[in-house]
């Protein structure tokens, strides 16, 4: 009788599975960031190392008992939950534990940095194998916080934190809306969102992904053969923690963009009730809870993307929004979203060194969003190609003019500030293959890629009758790089990929008024990676 | 994901001859002071000093000192409880609340964030 | 090899107390934990409570709080089981057992009887 | 508080029979569950340690397996000696030691 959790994110064929580095030992050390534990629990004995890290604040109250198993419990618990020889995610695997939460569970973002620095100390001193850091925390939202996570992630060390359990946008707490560490919020069995009392698990664009966390069994510090079943964001951060630690045991050269871009890729889609998340967060909210992947010596070249949105830009006449993909990954495309549909497109430009997708927002619009396709694209070389607004009237036309170059992506911005003096962008693979056409007024941006073997294609789906939304989807084998909504409707949200869904939205006034000859078409670019092959745009 | 959410920043104008010194003068403070919207998260009192990225190793050890001399000069005893060097530039703090506007004016300062409170999820 | 010796069993009057001995050999005495473990004629086993000879620390089922004391002498390698306010219900073999705390009872003494009756 | 549920409460079977005992906990327990047989007597001897793990000069007839809840000793053949009564038992937080109520495995 296996708990709930792990036969939900182990499929049957891991579950009896040894995860070992390719050398035979299992080099992944796992830090966990929590209270107190109790290392003499048979679930974790012998594979878990106390450090003498000690950073808490004062317990509050005069009449505070310190009780050991209470002290430990929490802590305890993950772990379990992480390496626990029963009811653990990755049995194997050794954990060193840094006290930075009191006995009431509670902690200061100073002594959070200060175990973080610890753990970066640690690693100068003597080199090891893969690090895991748990970070079971949260506090609200701290840039330090989230720039010393960002730094120690640079040097290679893989993040894991809990979204929060405030039923409240993740970006508005730390360490969770770093963008350098994997964010996980919290599914029960039925894989819907965490209630917790009034509250919950967060969610928003900062949660890379779901993880079980709702009555989690797990070591409990009573005795030292206990469980119980606690809940939160925690446990559902110790899952991911435990999967990313069981991916690395078995090919400890994964890095960051790699493990973030597989648990994504197959974690199980589209089971999550969006409606439980407020409306306005649902479209950024993953629906995604994590199994742990194959390796990849079973699963091939894959090309894996992932979608990244902004913040939102706010409501002012020339607010931009802007998302950024990670260091390792290229931004294969971007594309925008405004509730009001008033927004002046989007587009790719270069911000130290780096692609960044941004959006406009348009005078009396409520603000946009920048959709960014993050791709994880080997021994890649991309390029954007723009050309200006034509005269009225005018189509402009950009395609990929280098040799082997393909088109991943197309943007289109809008120097005008009137709506209806402007039709909407096209892009037409039976007339021009491999084309961004814009038409008047708008300047178009083609994102260009050439890769070993990427080869690519438009695939479009147009409806005529009344739809919020148009969608297409690459077909198994393909990845989404790029999504854009074609001219129709008077007025369109934007468009968005969810996963191998290009998703195009219309303004429900835009729906009423629209007569049955012009077609909202989403337009998706499918792009794949067949290593022995050249790139390739396939008509 | 990083961009400042629901967030506190102030930027503390305050007179810049201080107390008359040269080199105090001459430093107009372009740093920031940033704390935690949730008040009952917050910890006064303490506060993480973070410098510049490039700032070197000697260079966190003066200006913690330098806080420390400036503070004692208007009768202020200030802690400096740890010095960052590994994951950034920095030192933390305990002092007055009246010192940050004196703190924001230090060279290689990019920002002063009053510690808070993180709990377990 | 490892031995437990129980003794100090026999006949008590309601409403008496005894204390029952169990004399430790073959092995380090404070390295292991002790329990307490009766069994009533024909019944199964029911635990009593554990001593850790190391600490003196001990935990007991509640239904015998404050009836039941164990303690130990580390010098004589013995740890003592007192029971007060003795009742017919309480008429039992009672054994002591080697543990590790959350691991199994690996040794055993032969039991002592205590039968309580007027 | 942990319940351990034995069944069958009696098993009548013959020297060379494989008899087969169950446990049930009322709660997660993971492996840490251990088996004793008690002969009429005697004090209770450890035959089985963390669910599947023979005591030292344990005969290979005895096995125990499963986890989580759900736990099984086995005898693959029964030997003369083997009719005994047998005992699971966990530990937990209060009371920290919990035995099951016995099996009796008796000379069909």
């Known amino acids: 009788s296996i708990p709930w959790n792990l036969e939900r994110i182990i499929p049957a064929w891991h579950q009896t599975e040894e995860d070992r580095s390719p050398d035979g030992s299992s080099q992944v050390e796992v830090y966990l960031l929590d209270t107190s534990i109790q290392g003499a629990h048979r679930e974790i004995e012998g594979r878990v190392t106390i450090t003498d890290f000690n950073s808490v604040p004062e317990e509050d109250g005069t009449r505070f008992h310190r009780q050991a198993s209470k002290c430990d419990s929490h802590g305890t618990h993950l772990a379990g939950v992480v390496s626990g020889r029963d009811a653990g995610v990755a049995k194997g695997t050794s954990l060193h534990s840094l006290r930075v939460l009191n006995c009431q569970g509670k902690g200061t973002v100073s002594g959070t940095l200060i175990g973080l620095e610890f753990i970066r100390k640690s690693q100068l001193i003597q080199p090891s194998g893969p690090l895991v850091v748990l970070l079971p925390l949260a506090g609200g939202y701290s840039r330090i916080l989230n720039a010393a996570c960002r730094h120690l992630a640079r040097t290679g060390v893989v993040l894991v934190a809990a979204a929060g359990n405030f039923r409240d946008d993740a970006c508005l707490y730390s360490p969770a809306s770093a963008p350098e560490v994997i964010t996980v919020g919290a599914t029960n069995a039925q894989d819907q969102p965490v209630t917790l009392g009034t509250l919950g698990t967060n969610f928003g664009r900062c949660v890379d992904l779901f993880a079980p966390g709702k009555d989690i069994i797990g070591a409990s510090s009573d005795c030292s053969t206990c469980f119980m079943s606690q809940s939160g964001t925690s446990q559902a951060a110790a899952h991911v923690a435990g999967i990313v630690a069981r991916m690395l045991s078995r090919e400890p050269t994964l890095t960051l963009a790699e493990l973030r871009q597989r648990l994504i890729h197959f974690s199980t889609k589209d089971v999550i009730n969006m409606a439980w998340f407020p409306e306005d967060q649902q479209v950024l909210t993953p629906n995604l809870v994590a199994t742990l992947p194959p390796s990849t010596h079973e699963t091939g070249g894959q090309l894996l993307c992932r979608t990244v949105w902004s913040a939102h830009s706010g409501p002012t006449r020339t607010a931009t929004a802007t998302a950024r993909c990670a260091p390792e990954e290229e931004l294969l495309s971007c594309s925008s979203f405004s509730r009001s549909g008033r927004r002046r497109g989007d587009w790719i430009e270069a911000i130290g060194g780096q692609q960044v997708c941004k959006a406009l927002n348009a005078f009396g619009g409520e603000g946009v969003y920048a959709v960014a396709r993050c791709c994880l694209v080997p021994r890649a070389n991309c390029s954007i190609h723009n050309t200006p607004a034509a005269r009225a009237g005018l189509e402009t036309h950009v395609h990929c003019h280098q040799k082997d170059h393909v088109l991943t992506g197309c943007s289109f911005h809008w120097e005008v500030e009137d709506l209806s003096v402007r039709r909407q962008p096209a892009l037409r693979s039976r007339r021009q293959p491999g084309q961004c056409v814009g038409h008047q007024a708008a300047s178009v941006y083609a994102s260009c890629c050439h890769a070993p073997g990427l080869e690519c294609k438009i695939k479009e789906h147009g409806i005529s009758g009344p739809s919020e939304q148009v969608t297409v989807a690459c077909e198994a084998g393909w990845t989404l790089t790029g999504c854009n909504v074609l001219p129709g409707a008077s007025l369109t949200l934007g468009a968005y990929s969810v996963d191998n869904l290009c998703v195009a939205r219309v303004h429900d006034t835009a729906r009423a008024d629209r007569t049955s000859g012009e077609a909202t078409v989403a337009a998706a670019i499918c792009c794949r990676s067949r290593p022995s092959a050249k790139a390739s745009w396939v008509q | 994901q990083d961009e400042d959410g629901d967030y506190e920043e102030l930027m503390l104008a305050l007179p810049s001859q201080e107390d008359g010194l040269a080199d105090e003068a001459a430093h107009v403070a372009t740093a920031t002071f940033r704390r935690c919207s949730k008040e009952a998260w917050r910890l006064p009192g303490t506060y993480i000093v973070v410098l510049m990225e490039e700032t070197q190793r000697l260079q966190i050890e003066q200006t913690a000192h330098r806080l420390q001399t400036r503070a004692a000069r208007r009768g202020y005893v200030i802690k400096v409880l740890h010095i960052f060097y590994d994951l950034f530039p920095g030192f933390l703090v305990k002092m007055s609340s009246d010192l940050l506007g004196l703190a924001l004016k230090l060279p290689h300062v990019e920002y002063i964030e009053e510690d808070s409170f993180v709990f377990a999820q | 090899q490892v031995q437990l010796l129980e003794s100090g069993g026999g006949l008590v009057q309601p409403g008496g107390s005894l204390r029952l001995s169990c004399k430790a050999s073959?092995?380090?005495?404070?390295?292991?934990?002790f329990s307490w473990v009766r069994q009533a004629p024909g019944k199964g086993l029911e635990w009593i409570g554990y001593?850790?000879?190391?600490?003196?620390?001990?935990k007991y089922n509640q239904k015998f709080q404050g009836k039941a004391t164990i303690s130990r002498d580390n010098s004589k390698n013995t740890l003592y089981l007192q029971m007060n306010s003795l009742r017919a219900e309480d008429t039992a073999v009672y054994y002591c057992?080697?543990?590790?705390?959350?691991?199994?009872?690996?040794?055993w003494g032969q039991g002592t009887l205590v039968t309580v009756s007027s | 508080e942990i319940v351990l549920t034995q069944s069958p409460a009696t098993l009548s079977l013959s020297p060379g029979e494989r008899a087969t005992i169950t446990c049930r906990a009322s709660q997660y327990v993971g492996s840490y569950l251990n088996w004793y047989q008690q002969k009429p007597g005697q004090a209770p001897r450890l035959l089985i340690y963390?669910?599947?793990n023979r005591a030292t000069g344990i005969p290979a007839r005895f096995s125990g397996s499963g986890s989580g809840t759900d736990f099984t000793l086995t005898i693959s053949s029964l030997e003369p000696e083997d009719f005994a009564v047998y005992y699971c038992?966990?530990?937990?937080?209060?009371?920290?030691?919990?035995f099951g109520g016995g099996t009796k495995v008796e000379i069909k």
């Open positions: 073959g092995y380090t005495f404070s390295s292991y934990s």
């Open positions: 057992a080697r543990q590790r705390v959350g691991y199994s009872l690996d040794y």
């Open positions: 963390d669910a599947s």
């Open positions: 038992q966990v530990w937990d937080s209060s009371p920290p030691v919990v």
């Open positions: 001593i850790d000879p190391g600490s003196g620390g001990t």
